[in-house]
Amino acid sequence: MKVLQEPACVSDYMSISTCEWKMGGPTNCSAELRLLYQLVFQSSETHTCVPENNGGVGCVCHLLMDDVVSMDNYTLDLWAGQQLLWKGSFKPSEHVKPRAPGNLTVHTNVSDTVLLTWSNPYPPDNYLYNDLTYAVNIWSENDPAYSRIHNVTYLKPTLRIPASTLKSGISYRARVRAWAQHYNTTWSEWSPSTKWYNSYREPFEQR
């Protein structure tokens, strides 16, 4: 049994780090493998993560962690029974993938504006809370050629779009993702999408 692609880990900078790797052949990850992790810190103990399958040869492990601080460094040991398959380390603050924003809502009753709001996925005491910027993807299932990305570089999790810039009488979908500039993170996963019908019609005089 051997590792084909070494574990790569990302942290949500809150309570979970996710490690993914690939094995040399089909593996029952939860039955055959264990990922042991330990914070390099006075009197820390070793903790065990039971991996799940992620495709035929892929494994994924969700490591429970305390709040992340920049000094934190973990040793990682991947075991198959008594056999050490791989040894490495992981500094969560240097491999951050933010949590996806949630509660994406579309408000269409605001005169001639489509208002999108969503929730910051972090509590106010988390360092990422005030560092997130967003990308909102809007597309139309009726008009495959229409897809736009709106970059939200201010802190407030809202986006206003003039309804007149969207075609009337068709449905649109939106989703949002986040990243934290000062922490050099990757983009989060996209939030679940939300759908709305654009019923806005220009005033008669403007037609």
């Epitope: 914070l39 810190f41 006075q42 009197s43 820390s44 103990e45 070793t46 903790h47 429970l64 962690m65 305390d66 601080v69 920049s70 000094m71 934190d72």
Partner: antibody
Framework: EVQLVESGGGLEQPGGSLRLSCAGS????????MTWVRQAPGKGLEWVSS????????YYADSVKGRFTISRDNSKNTLYLQMNSLRAEDTAVYYC??????????????????WGQGTTVTVSS | DIVMTQSPLSLPVTPGEPASISCRSS???????????VDWYLQKSGQSPQLLIY???KRASGVPDRFSGSGSGTDFTLKISRVEAEDVGFYYC?????????FGQGTKLEIK
């Protein structure tokens, strides 16, 4: 009441051995790291050794490394310090102390918040 | 090893007056914001040491509020706002960021 009680001290000749014990009560013993600190007559405090809650990690002062062994029996809520190859400079009052909560991912530290009453070790010929 | 240096080593104080003890570490004992791994202990004559302050500025349970700790990184201070007769003894700072844990030399507080 959270309490630590040491025992096992006494008079021993240079080169001899002693085993100190420290019995804990009033807290979940296995969840906490434990530490030994000593104080030579008329001197300050000196850290000797520490052990994590599950016993998997042990730490020693250079002055005792290779001669002293720290261990614990969580089923008996007891901490030990096996002292071999004793020297005159090991003469001191030995205290055990409750250290950090080590079962959490990042151990939680509240200081050495409980100390035993101390047990005296005298090494002399 | 991290060296902890205390001053003064002797501190005569009049009851009711404030007192201050300084402790300097040879390298930073700050692990993350708010987590300075420095404690203060008081050892009264013939007794075991007792914890006063942990993590630089957190008062241990049952410790009177006249005791306070401050500082960050390498410089720390224990203050007693109004010294009482029962406060006499040796005061030690200690770092526990990493082993070996190291203590200051101790400060003897005595009543004038």
């Amino acid at each position: 009441e959270v309490q630590l009680v040491e025992s096992g001290g006494g008079l021993e000749q240079p080169g001899g051995s002693l085993r100190l014990s420290c019995a804990g009560s009033g807290f979940t013993f296995r969840d906490f790291a434990m530490t030994w600190v000593r104080q030579a007559p008329g001197k300050g405090l000196e850290w000797v050794s520490s052990i994590s809650g599950d016993g998997s990690n042990t730490y020693y002062a250079d002055s005792v490394k290779g001669r002293f062994t720290i261990s614990r029996d969580n089923s008996k809520n007891t901490l030990y310090l096996q002292m071999n190859s004793l020297r005159a400079e090991d003469t001191a009052v030995y205290y055990c102390a409750k250290d950090r909560l080590s079962k959490t991912i990042r151990p939680r530290y509240y200081g050495l918040d409980v100390w035993g009453q101390g047990t005296t070790v005298t090494v002399s010929s | 090893d991290i060296v902890m240096t205390q001053s003064p080593l002797s501190l005569p104080v009049t009851p009711g007056e404030p007192a201050s003890i300084s402790c300097r570490s040879s390298q930073s004992v700050l692990y993350s914001i708010g987590y300075n791994y420095v404690d203060w202990y008081l050892q009264k004559s013939g007794q075991s040491p007792q914890l006063l302050i942990y993590l630089g500025n957190k008062r241990a349970s049952g410790v009177p509020d006249r005791f306070s700790g401050s500082g960050s990184g390498t410089d720390f201070t224990l203050k007693i706002s109004r010294v009482e007769a029962e406060d006499v003894g040796f005061y030690y700072c200690m770092q526990s960021l990493q082993t070996p844990y190291t203590f200051g030399q101790g400060t003897k507080l005595e009543i004038k």
